[in-house]
């Protein structure tokens, strides 16, 4: 009679003797910023310490009746989901609760900020093991709250937050929109996005992943043995906080970037029905449902990458969009996407000592997205090699000429308003290792990296007839680092990576007609690190 949500986050390959972090999160402390809680509930008794922190606004309405069990309801349930004895994810994790939400579930930005500062000070006074902070709350976008989350994350704390229950773009809310925070949307037992009345889970590029968030059984503050079912992105975030505690207990040295990459890597892929999301948000919303790793061993050898979408550039002629990787991640490739197809490509450029991915809108375009492929590559030395537009009809080429450097991604950027009006090259060179090729009117940018044991290969998939989507995937053991389209495809809307698959999107085929120009070739660059593989074998 295991609750559906706990069954869902347990991978199919799970074996009880294989995934056993020390007492299921016992090395980790989880801070919960929420309502008050019933700490003597049997599910969490002895596992949750109620701090003396309280910063809440007055309840609305003169006739509001403060009933303890109602005041404690939300927080008690979430504490149970994280670390409850019976229905908890990380049954060994200890928790500390801070009251930042009142009996009506309302809080203030200032109260949350002071709560975060309280945690920071506690961490400085008495440093413990890894810390996870669960923020099961969402309010309007707040630059100051996002900045506070960034500061705490850069101090080594893992922050997990609810995407929000407004059936809206999570980027419009805080702390969900803070890039340093792990933002969680909610799915149900059918792996569908959760509907809550007329609203439901938030979505979009600011969501990192989804987790069970409907009909979640957990501790009820009604009585010491009571259980209740609750729904929402708060419950989903609590699952991820629990999974994070399990992972950190098994590998206490994991950085935030490493943890996020692992959460993404071990998630169930492509199980959510995207039709629930607004059409313009489907491509931006990760189709990922959180799960525990099947094993804590052997994860170290993997080359982990994730896709980061920028905000929309807006429609102005010179508008650009920028996608950034986290401080500990390497930008291994950069691509762009425009629903109208009017774009001027993308390029990698240095900004504040780090590479960023910038996409350029074109005249008459409705705007573009920049798409960064962000990877964990220890001891990497990456640079961008650029070739200006070529005079020859063969098109522009650029390769990695430094000894020991391999090609991880190709980008192209052009100044002409619409490359589609220019006849493509007669000869279309095939993709070659360590070489990017593009239109003669375009600048071509090659991302070249040197890292111990890094090897990469180019994989292509071409379709002669027009298709709205062409994909090419990296095989088992290889990780997609670069995704682009070969030149000669005048109607390409853009390219982007979805997990380990490179997707090249084209205009609706009915508008382009079936000509030789309709041919679409998706080019994937697949990499692996022999060094990481050897290192993990030595550890075992």
């Amino acid at each position: 009679s295991i609750p559906w949500n706990l069954e869902r986050i347990t991978p199919p390959r799970y074996r009880a003797d294989e995934y056993q972090p020390p007492d299921g999160g016992s090395l980790v402390e989880v801070y919960l910023l929420d309502t008050s809680i019933q700490s003597d509930h049997r599910e969490i008794e002895g596992r949750v310490m109620v701090t003396d922190f309280e910063n809440v606004p007055e309840e609305d309405g003169t006739r509001f009746h403060r009933q303890a069990s109602k005041c404690d309801s939300h927080g008690t349930h979430l504490a149970g989901v994280v670390s409850g004895r019976d229905a908890g994810v990380a049954k060994g994790a200890s928790m500390r609760s801070l009251r930042v939400l009142n009996c009506q579930g309302k809080g203030t930005v200032s109260g949350t900020l002071i709560g975060l500062e309280f945690i920071r000070k506690s961490q400085l006074v008495q440093p413990v093991g890894p810390l996870v902070v669960l923020l099961p709350l969402a309010g309007g976008y707040s630059r100051v709250l996002n900045a506070a989350c960034q500061r705490l994350a850069r101090a080594g704390v893992v922050l997990v937050t609810a995407a929000g229950n407004f059936r809206d773009d999570a980027c419009l809310y805080s702390p969900a929109s803070a890039p340093e925070v792990i933002t969680v949307g909610a799915t149900n037992a059918q792996d569908q996005p959760v509907t809550l009345g007329t609203l439901g889970t938030n979505f979009g590029r600011c969501v990192d992943l989804f987790a069970p968030g409907e009909d979640i059984i957990g501790a009820s503050s009604d009585c010491s043995t009571c259980f209740v079912s609750q729904s929402g992105t708060s419950q989903a975030a609590a699952h991820v906080a629990g999974i994070a505690a399990m992972m950190l207990s098994a590998e206490p040295e994991l950085t935030l970037a490493e943890l996020r990459q692992r959460l993404i890597h071990f998630s169930a892929k492509d199980v959510i029905n995207e039709a629930w999301f607004p059409e313009d948000q489907r491509v931006l919303t990760p189709n990922l449902v959180a799960a525990l790793p099947p094993s804590t061993h052997g994860a170290g050898w993997q080359l982990f990458c994730r896709t980061v979408w920028s905000a929309h550039s807006g429609p102005t002629r010179m508008a650009t969009a920028v996608a950034r990787c986290a401080p500990d991640e390497e930008l291994l490739s950069c691509s762009s996407f425009s629903r109208s197809g009017k774009r001027r490509g993308e390029r990698m450029e240095a900004q504040g000592g780090k590479l960023v991915c910038r996409a350029h809108n074109a005249f008459g375009g409705e705007g573009v997205y920049a798409i960064a492929r962000c990877c964990l590559l220890p001891q990497a030395n990456c640079s961008v090699h650029t070739a200006p537009p070529a005079e020859a009809s063969m098109g522009t080429r650029v390769h990695c000429h430094q000894q020991g450097h391999v090609l991880t991604g190709c980008s192209s950027h052009w100044e002409v308003e619409d490359l589609g009006t220019h006849k493509p090259p007669v000869l279309r060179p095939r993709g070659q290792p360590n070489q990017c090729v593009g239109h003669r009117e375009a600048s071509i940018h090659a991302s070249c990296c040197h890292a111990p044991g890094l090897e990469c290969k180019v994989k292509e998939h071409g379709i002669p007839a027009p298709q709205e989507q062409v994909t090419v995937a990296c095989e088992e053991g290889w990780t997609l680092t670069g995704c682009s389209a070969l030149p000669g495809t005048s109607h390409v809307l853009g390219a982007y990576a979805v997990d380990n698959t490179c997707v090249v999107r084209s205009r609706d085929v009915s508008t382009t007609g079936s000509t030789s120009e309709g041919a679409v070739t998706a080019v994937a660059i697949c990499c692996r690190s022999r060094h990481l593989a050897q290192a993990s074998q030595e550890l075992q």
Epitope: S1, R42, A87, G92, D222, T225, C226
Partner: antibody, heavy 119, light 113 residues
């Protein structure tokens, strides 16, 4: 089948120590709470406390706090009730029983252990 | 603590007749979270451990004859044996399991008249 098997009857003198056991089988021992219940001769049932074998956390009835110690060894699916210094008033039948979050009532009981304390 | 009070203390009923035992809790054991009453009934025969008969105030445990039924809500509960059989001679206990310490009624002894 699911069962809780308790250790045999004990006859002790006042001041002696004692540890009685309750072994679970036929189910996942760490998924259930084990409670101990006292029944003095000719009297009713009194709940003494529970232990969660998964983390060995205990919760005692205030009336029994400090009088007895509840423990468990999950590796052998066994819970224990012990006294460091028995009194004549500890003479009773002691039962173990199991419950869990979805079934918080006692659905399976041990056969009981009779403890007699007499000088 | 929640105090459980049973009535009567003992009951003598003819074979085939109805036996009714009452149980009152000092505070409600009905909770809105799942709309359930956290109350159980147990039967204890001489020399045996208690046996679960009824849980959630009215749900019969599997294998328990259907002549046993539970009813009531909030603070007042009843165990009914619709047609007393010889094997039903025992002491019956009600129990609340919503808060600690868990408490039992003092017991009702059922005999054959």
């Amino acid at each position: 089948q699911v069962q809780l098997v308790q250790s045999g009857a004990e006859v002790k003198k006042p001041g002696e120590s004692l540890k009685i056991s309750c072994k679970g089988s036929g189910y996942s021992f760490t998924d259930y709470y084990i409670s101990w219940v006292r029944q003095m001769p000719g009297k009713g049932l009194e709940w003494m406390g529970w232990i969660y074998p998964g983390d060995s956390y205990t919760h005692y009835n205030p009336n029994f706090q400090g009088q007895v110690t509840i423990s468990a060894d999950k590796s052998i699916s066994t819970a224990y009730l012990q006294w460091s210094s028995l009194k004549a008033s500890d003479t009773a039948m002691y039962y173990c029983a199991r419950d869990r979050w979805s079934t918080p009532y006692f659905d399976v009981w041990g056969q009981g252990t009779l403890v007699t304390v007499s000088s | 603590d929640i105090v459980m009070t049973q009535s009567p203390d003992s009951l003598a009923v003819s074979l085939g007749e109805r036996a009714t035992i009452n149980c009152r809790s000092s505070q409600s054991v009905l909770y809105s979270s799942n709309n359930k009453n956290y109350l159980a009934w147990y039967q204890q025969k001489p020399g045996q451990p208690p046996k679960l008969l009824i849980y959630w105030a009215s749900t019969r445990e599997s294998g328990v004859p259907d002549r046993f039924s539970g009813s009531g809500s909030g603070t007042d509960f009843t165990l009914t044996i619709s047609s007393l059989q010889a094997e039903d001679v025992a002491v019956y206990y009600c129990q609340q399991y919503s808060s600690f310490p868990i408490t039992f009624g003092q017991g009702t002894k059922v005999e054959i008249k």
